[in-house]
């Protein structure tokens, strides 16, 4: 089939980085500057993506592949192929539809993106709060209250504190 196609369609011989130029008797012409073709047999080259404004170039366009963008500091990528740049917030905040807002009491965010999440409820695991939570950090759970009572024997070591960010939702 491939051989038949190439006999019928001279354009199928044009490799990536070129296009089949109808104006020049269907010979393979290199893609013009700022354009590319990522597959063979194309009749046009695609315009390179330009990373402007809040977008910055992560990978330059070549004759065979499009440019890739990411976001300038203070922003992070969203969408397929970084089609959008969303602003970062500070730790202890979340991005709402109207901008960055502090986490409500009882919630935290230890990253510059994402949402505020509830502090871990230590008592659900029969533990006590060892370190209080903040807007930026989850609580640290310690031994159960019974383990801390006077005269209690410490046969088993206390369970390790739960990692921040792994609170039940």
């Amino acid at each position: 089939f491939e051989r038949t196609r190439s006999l019928q369609d001279p354009c199928s011989n044009c490799p990536a980085g070129t296009f089949c130029d109808n104006n020049r008797n269907q010979i393979c012409s290199p893609c013009p500057p700022n354009s590319f073709s990522s597959a063979g047999g194309q009749r046009t080259c695609d315009i390179c993506r330009q990373c402007k404004g809040v977008f910055r170039t992560r990978k330059e366009c070549s004759s065979t592949s499009n440019a890739e963008c990411d976001c300038t500091p203070g922003f992070h990528c969203l969408g397929a192929g970084c089609s959008m740049c969303e602003q970062d917030c500070k730790q202890g905040q979340e991005l709402t539809k109207k901008g960055c807002k502090d986490c409500c009491f009882g919630t935290f965010n230890d990253q510059k993106r994402g949402i505020c999440r509830p502090w871990t409820n230590c008592s659900l695991d029969g533990k006590s709060v060892l370190v209080n939570g903040t807007k930026e950090r989850d609580v640290v759970c310690g031994p159960s209250p019974a383990d801390l009572s006077p005269g209690a024997s410490s046969v088993t070591p206390p369970a390790p504190a739960r990692e921040p960010g792994h609170s039940p939702q």
Epitope: L95, T96, K97, K98, I115
Partner: nanobody, 124 residues
Framework: EVQLLESGGGLVQPGGSLRLSCAAS????????MTWVRQPPEKGLKWVSS????????YYTDSVKGRFTISRDNSRNTLYLQMNRLTAEDTAVYFC?????????????????WGQGTTVTVSS
């Protein structure tokens, strides 16, 4: 596969109007709130408007209130943004987005699918 495809962008003079459409497929459209956001040149993403699954509740950012109208046709799986009295500040790439539940508000982002965007340029 869940897909959102925006259309209707273009070049318009200040004071003019445009109607953006967003064709949805791959999910039960009426079960989910939908949102329009925009990315102006040189700036980050900004929320524009949201509508709940039934189309009964709508929300707008302050700068577009009274000029933009969000609506949806659940029988056609299509979201709309009617934009009137456009100014240069409305120049942006506009994206439609699917939220994760049927209800929405003007606070939390709950977006799980984005479209590819349509460009609106307001210039004389």
């Amino acid at each position: 596969e869940v897909q959102l495809l925006e259309s209707g962008g273009g070049l318009v003079q200040p004071g003019g109007s445009l109607r953006l459409s967003c064709a949805a497929s791959g999910f039960i459209f009426s079960n989910f709130a939908m949102t329009w956001v925009r990315q102006p040149p040189e700036k980050g993403l900004k929320w524009v408007s949201s509508i709940n699954g039934s189309g009964f509740n709508t929300y707008y950012t302050d700068s577009v209130k009274g000029r933009f109208t969000i609506s949806r046709d659940n029988s056609r799986n299509t979201l709309y943004l009617q934009m009137n009295r456009l100014t240069a500040e409305d120049t942006a790439v506009y994206f439609c987005a699917k939220e994760g539940s049927s209800e929405t508000d003007d606070h939390y982002y709950n977006v799980d699918v984005w479209g590819q965007g349509t460009t609106v340029t307001v210039s004389s």
